[in-house]
């Protein structure tokens, strides 16, 4: 229940005090260069989240202004910028926009809850699905692999589309699509397991559209601390949706007496949410990029975006670190409940399990811990980072690194504690997961800082692809393979069932340490990459001829 698709969403943070004065000077200079002191009405209310649709550009570090480039025939509107005085002052917005943006963020977060609710409803009734279709463990693995692989492949495609086309339409279509597929999958006859596999693949495609694009809309609707707050709410949706998915799965199944009904809840809610997104989410413009009009889009190809991202060392290292988190969460999520059950068998506090659900109680406890630590981790990480930003410009990657290295210690301690105390093991899981999840929102901040707005959806998608490919796409199977390998060379006993899985899971803390190292590497390049991104954003504020991305 610990997926990280959204970990790389756009997120802005509180800027460092020492740089504020310089930014204000730059902003005022840009405003003068843009030429006007008078103010006229905004050209349209369409660009929610950017001040007046054509002029003030919310960058990573403040706002800049440029001369508006209206379509031919539009009367020139020189200086349609804010005349507001003082740092950070924003232009007047249409009256409804404030409330509208809040509603939009709430709807997008609700959509994210449903994304994860849908995914984990299937996890909640997986045993029933296995029982009904006669699915072997390798078949259950296939269901997960197909979902992750289709998600992985679709994410970069939606990243490309999300940087170039109407995002709320793509979002709504994505939700309608996975809702229809999930609903249909509840009617698949027993003999058509391959149709269930296909449906999971299609759901992965639908959900990829959401996880890739929704955070970038929130990133464009809000700035600075408000954006951080809204993205935190968006992230809380992950553990909340995951937990609700398990609960929905089991409770609806019990109430209806048939697991198929569990798969009909999220699609109904999905259809409603998709409609609300179409109605309530404004057609946001992409940060500053909208102000630059079409000439920017004409000059930046997908290939160029990819090259720029691959050359961006902070982005590359933070993506590798995210992969390490994904590796650990994927493996732990799948194997820890069974590991703890086996620990109890060894301690003679539980019976050897011959028929499912094995470790159902442990799954439930682990699920509850994951939900809470997901929430706590985001809060802790965001709070720690805001405090550390007062001390250093490298706060974001350093807090992530400390979280990762601390997490590795507690993940190691799980295997020490499990031999004698299940409660001790749960405490270690709690602390370890909280530290591991503390980088969810921060990784998003890092991406936001070092990637220019017109590449954010692509960046989110590529990071999502990488974290799955190197992370949870293979880790559960690798752990299972190592465990089986160890068991083959030992005698068949409950003790060795427990020990072999424990030894295999010891790979996780090593990968987490590696992730911590990647965050430390990110810290080395973070300041320079961030400065380069800001410089590009400021270049974009100049006349079109000088724009170079």
């Amino acid at each position: 229940m610990m997926c990280l698709e959204c970990a790389s969403a756009a997120a802005g943070g509180a800027e460092e005090e020492e740089a504020d004065a310089e930014r204000r000077r730059r902003r005022r200079g840009a405003q003068r260069g843009a030429g006007g002191s008078g103010c006229c009405g905004a050209r349209g209310a369409g660009g929610a989240g950017v001040s007046a649709a054509g002029d003030e550009v919310q960058t990573l570090s403040g706002s800049v202004r440029r001369a508006p480039t209206g379509p031919p025939g539009t009367p020139g509107t020189p200086g349609c910028a804010a005349t507001a005085k003082g740092p950070g002052a924003q232009q007047p917005k249409p009256a409804s926009l404030g409330r509208g943006r809040g509603a939009a963020a709430a709807i997008l977060s609700l959509g994210n809850v449903l994304n994860y609710l849908d995914r984990y409803t299937v996890a909640g009734v997986l045993l029933d699905i296995q029982q009904h279709f006669g699915v072997k463990d390798r078949g259950a693995g296939l269901l997960q692999s197909v979902f992750i692989c289709s998600f992985m492949v679709a994410a970069p495609i939606f990243g490309y589309l999300g940087d170039r086309f109407n995002r709320k339409v793509i979002l709504s279509c994505g939700i309608f699509f996975w809702s229809a597929v999930t609903f249909s999958s509840s009617f698949i006859p027993q003999q058509y397991f391959w149709l269930l596999v296909l449906s999971r693949g299609l759901v992965g495609i639908g959900e990829a559209s959401y996880s890739t694009i929704a955070p970038t809309i929130i990133g464009d609707l809000f700035t600075k601390n408000t954006r951080t707050l809204m993205l935190s709410v968006f992230y809380f949706a992950i553990p909340l949706g995951s937990g609700l998915g398990y609960i929905t799965g089991s409770s609806v199944k019990q109430a209806a007496g048939d697991w198929a009904w569990a798969l009909r809840v999220s699609p109904v809610l999905g259809m409603i949410t998709g409609t609300l997104i179409l109605i309530l989410v404004p057609a946001t413009k992409r940060g500053h990029a909208d102000q630059l009009g079409d000439q920017l889009k004409a000059r930046t190809s997908w290939l160029r975006d990819m090259k720029a991202l691959i050359r961006n060392r902070s982005y590359v290292f933070s993506s590798l670190a995210t992969s390490a988190v994904s590796f650990a969460t994927g493996a732990l999520g799948m194997w820890i409940p069974l590991y703890l059950h086996r620990a109890q068998v060894v301690q003679k506090t539980a019976e050897t399990c011959n028929s499912p659900p094995c470790g159902a109680k442990d799954s439930l406890i682990f699920g509850a811990i994951t939900c809470f630590t997901g929430f706590l981790g985001v809060v802790t990480g965001a709070g720690a980072t805001r405090w550390c930003r007062l001390k250093t410009q490298r706060a974001d990657p350093l807090v992530c690194a400390v979280g990762m290295l601390g997490s590795a210690i507690f993940i190691c301690l799980i295997f020490v504690a499990a031999k004698s105390s299940i409660v001790g093991a749960y405490i270690c899981i709690f602390v370890g997961e909280t530290l591991l999840f503390s980088n969810w929102a921060i990784t998003a901040d890092i991406l936001m800082y070092v990637v220019i707005p017109t590449r954010r959806a692509t960046a989110v998608a590529l990071q999502s692809f990488t974290s799955h490919l190197l992370g949870d796409a293979g880790s559960p199977y690798l752990i299972g393979f190592i465990s089986d390998l160890i068991r083959q060379s030992t005698k068949d006993s409950p003790l060795w069932e427990f020990l072999s899985l424990g030894y295999a899971l010891m790979l996780c803390p090593f990968v987490v340490v590696l992730g911590g190292m990647f965050f430390l590497a990110t810290a080395l390049f973070f300041v320079s990459d961030r400065a380069r991104a800001e410089q590009q954003v400021n270049q974009l504020a100049m006349p079109p001829a000088s724009v170079k991305v």
């Epitope: 029982q131 279709f133 006669g134 699915v135 072997k136 463990d137 390798r138 003999q191 499912p356």
Partner: antibody, heavy 125, light 107 residues
Framework: EVQLVETGGGLVRPGSSLKLSCATS????????MSWVRQAPGKGLEWVAL??????????NYAESIKGRFTISRDDSKSRVYLQMNTLRDQDTATYYC????????????????WGQGVMVTVSS | DIVLTQSPPTLSVTPGESVSLSCRAS??????IHWYQQRSNESPRLLIK???QSIAGIPSRFSGSGSGTDFILSINRVESEDFSVYYC?????????FGPGTKLEVK
């Protein structure tokens, strides 16, 4: 050619135990789910127990009427499936069939595509 | 548990006639029904799987239909070797259950 051969039947007293064995050949036993189905004299068919393959953790399922008394097990190295019957009752008198479930690698059918010739178990005092 | 009811319990026909055997489930089971034939003093054999899917080696005169709760096994032009007992089985949920059987006898 798929072959299922049951052995171990006979006449026993109520309360005693008996172990049925089913030797298989002609297919990949380790990947296949196996079941025992019984038929009381002059009556219909009744499913008794199912054992899944190692890829499904050799999970066992039982009919309510025999739960706690009968145990199904398998030995992949010998391609054999067993039914350990304890605390036998008069109503356990039946012909016991060893059956195979059709396998599709990722999943298995719950129906029986091959049946053994059956072995008679008589519980009587 | 899902209960299967077969009707009629006994069916008397003359060779060459076509017959339909019925199986009704106590709840909706989609197409998770299978048909077996058991000749006298022999083991059962699978005739039809998943309500209508044919099995290799089974004569084409055997066919199945139905979905939900009502299922039919049809035998087109009954032959002498077809006189036996026919059972339906559900695999929608555990425990696996069989119908009581329909005996097809010579008129």
């Amino acid at each position: 050619e798929v072959q299922l051969v049951e052995t171990g039947g006979g006449l026993v007293r109520p309360g005693s135990s008996l172990k049925l064995s089913c030797a298989t050949s002609g297919f990949t036993f380790s990947d296949t789910w196996m079941s025992w189905v019984r038929q009381a004299p002059g009556k219909g068919l009744e499913w008794v127990a199912l054992i899944k393959d190692k890829n499904s953790n050799s999970e066992a399922n039982y009919a309510e009427s025999i739960k706690g008394r009968f145990t199904i097990s398998r030995d992949d190295s010998k391609s054999r499936v067993y039914l350990q019957m304890n605390t036998l009752r008069d109503q356990d008198t039946a012909t016991y069939y060893c059956t195979r479930h059709e396998d599709f690698y990722y999943y298995s059918g719950y129906y029986f595509d091959y049946w053994g010739q059956g072995v008679m178990v008589t519980v009587s005092s | 548990d899902i209960v299967l009811t077969q009707s009629p319990p006994t069916l008397s026909v003359t060779p060459g006639e076509s017959v339909s055997l019925s199986c009704r489930a106590s709840q909706g089971i989609s197409t998770s029904i299978h048909w077996y034939q058991q000749r006298s003093n022999e083991s059962p054999r699978l005739l039809i799987k998943y309500a209508s899917q044919s099995i290799a080696g089974i004569p084409s005169r055997f066919s199945g239909s139905g979905s939900g709760t009502d299922f039919i096994l049809s035998i087109n032009r009954v032959e002498s070797e077809d006189f036996s007992v026919y059972y339906c089985q559900q695999t929608y949920s555990l425990p696996l259950t069989f119908g009581p059987g329909t005996k097809l006898e010579v008129k």
